[in-house]
Amino acid sequence: REEAKPYPLFPGPFPGSLQTDHTPLLSLPHASGYQPALMFSPTQPGRPHTGNVAIPQVTSVESKPLPPLAFKHTVGHIILSEHKGVKFNCSISVPNIYQDTTISWWKDGKELLGAHHAITQFYPDDEVTAIIASFSITSVQRSDNGSYICKMKINNEEIVSDPIYIEVQGLPHFTKQPESMNVTRNTAFNLTCQAVGPPEPVNIFWVQNSSRVNEQPEKSPSVLTVPGLTEMAVFSCEAHNDKGLTVSKGVQINIKAIPSPPTEVSIRNSTAHSILISWVPGFDGYSPFRNCSIQVKEADPLSNGSVMIFNTSALPHLYQIKQLQALANYSIGVSCMNEIGWSAVSPWILASTTEGAPSVAPLNVTVFLNESSDNVDIRWMKPPTKQQDGELVGYRISHVWQSAGISKELLEEVGQNGSRARISVQVHNATCTVRIAAVTRGGVGPFSDPVKIFIPAHGWVDYAPSSTPAPGNA
């Protein structure tokens, strides 16, 4: 099928158009013994010369000026459907005095190199050689759309053919499709759809959950404003042109919601005063997690039930809970939030702190000399239960004996029962400095402030005790 097309579709004058759904076979002289050759010009891509005429400076033996060289006019506009084949050519007659003429093909200002089906055929005569350069595409695609020209180089002159415009028509092609979105419930949002031909125009219909949204089509591009959704929906757009319709990908529009609680919580490590936990976040409710909250309460049924709350960033799903009591049981729950709100708290899990070394020293340390038995008696009060940080297994007593020129330190371990001890006098006429620390399986606590007592030489009597005051008694 051939038909003339009006010129204004493309810039520049050209003799006519061919609309075809088959390979156009142009009538060519078929000289016997033609020489097909693949010829590609080494010329660099560049703007073609305006016009298609060159007047060579070379003259014949008789110095007769040669006629101007020009490509013959050919079809100017070919319209065809995608995947069809097309063949077009340009021809020129060149006086035989010119050697090594090459024809190159250019598309939209760029030379076509490589694996294109370009064949140049030569038909020599007495004075001139007819050269026909054919270009064929077996299955056209949209990317083949454009303006094709031939270029010939003779004696550093460039001869340029008229353009041949190839217009590949097909189903609408999407240049912009709707995108998946996560939106707030009952909040308006926009979706965009854009498709192109040729052929134009392209009309757009919107589809929501398999039902058309607009009864009348909109010209591409189209923006759909959705006033708001209460539940998830799938949107797509249909693009129609004279060749048929193309449907975009379906995109899911999700409604943002509060997240689900974490699916796992792990107790990574426990110390006397801290617990390291990690968690696996639940479903994010289509909105990124912002932060998480760790709720901690004492598991002891007799506790007052108050909840400690520790806020942390959503990443890295890890938190060290600090300032906890030693050797205590805790219930822990984790909750995370996004822009919509907080998740429910995870199921409560149990975790325990370990035993620690006591955090305070024994109180009211008193030291006095029992001269009759040549002993030093020591008395104290055990640290407050809350600060024992475990089960007391005993005490460590440090006593340092200092007299002129000598100093020696001794350590004693005593059992947890009672709060007194007796140590033998090591040196007379010396100062004894006593310090006591409480001991649990978690370690040795801090030593008490030093208490000094003077041990006189034999025969002196001094029963006055030395002591450290209990807190608040000073």
Epitope: P261, T263, E264, S266, S270, S346, L350
Partner: antibody, heavy 128, light 111 residues
């Protein structure tokens, strides 16, 4: 839609091995612990083991050594490798999603809170 | 290993009846409440009914309720419906142990 589909069951001779698969859709194995449970014909449910989101596994004492749980998160599939099969292993094998799980890494154990989504099961018959 | 014992093992009842199933644990359940109830119909997979001893799973009718703590738990169906004839299992976990124990099951059948 969230779904679990077991496969790989069938007739197997005593002493043989079999690998069951549990294909997960609608949620990710990297965010949820998963479990295997079996049910002998006419009997009750029996827990086999669990694989946490990070890949740690815990098994019932009777299953240790013969049954191994693994997963391929890229395929969103969990597996149960069963070796040295016996007639008493004949059962329907279910995979189930663990709704919540607490792990005690330092002590190498973990506790299931609930199994909130189950597959339809696959029958394994061990017989000569 | 800890054990969960359900009673009765079989229960005959009529539509509209109030039904109670008990589940006793040989030691305290983790956190005293990490006990779940499952419903299973012949040839089908179990379905979660109740977790945390008393919380209803999503989509479960309100005629189902659970109670209990520590070692004693109860599942109650306030008014038995035709769709409720099935086998019910309790299950739970324990501190210091990965095992997830199931009760022996209670079959609720039509009287």
């Amino acid at each position: 839609e969230q779904q679990l589909v077991e496969s790989g069951g069938g007739l197997i001779q005593p002493g043989g091995s079999l690998r069951l698969s549990c294909a997960v859709s609608g949620f990710s194995l990297s965010s949820n612990a998963m479990s295997w449970v079996r049910q002998a014909p006419g009997k009750g449910l029996e827990w086999i083991g669990i694989i946490s989101s990070s890949g740690s596994t815990y098994s019932a004492s009777w299953a240790k050594g013969r049954f191994t749980i693994s997963k391929d998160s890229s395929k969103n599939t969990m597996y149960l490798q069963m070796n040295s099969l016996r007639a008493e292993d004949t059962a329907v094998y279910f995979c189930a999603r663990v709704g919540f799980f607490v792990g005690y890494g330092a002590y190498d154990y973990g506790i299931i809170h609930r199994l909130d989504l189950w597959g339809q099961g696959t029958l394994v018959t061990v017989s000569s | 290993d800890a054990q969960l014992t359900q009673s009765p093992s079989t229960l005959s009842a009529s539509v509209g009846d109030r039904v109670t199933i008990t589940c006793q644990s040989s030691k305290s359940i983790y956190n005293n409440n990490w006990l779940s109830w499952y419903q299973q119909k012949p040839g089908k997979a179990p379905k979660l009914l109740i977790y945390d001893a008393s919380d209803l799973a999503s989509g479960v009718p309100s005629r189902f309720s659970g109670s209990g703590s520590g070692t004693e738990f109860t599942l109650t169906i306030s008014s038995l419906q035709p769709d409720d004839f099935a086998t019910y299992y309790c299950a739970g976990g324990y501190s210091g142990d990965s095992d997830y124990a199931f009760g022996g099951g209670t079959k609720v059948e039509i009287k």
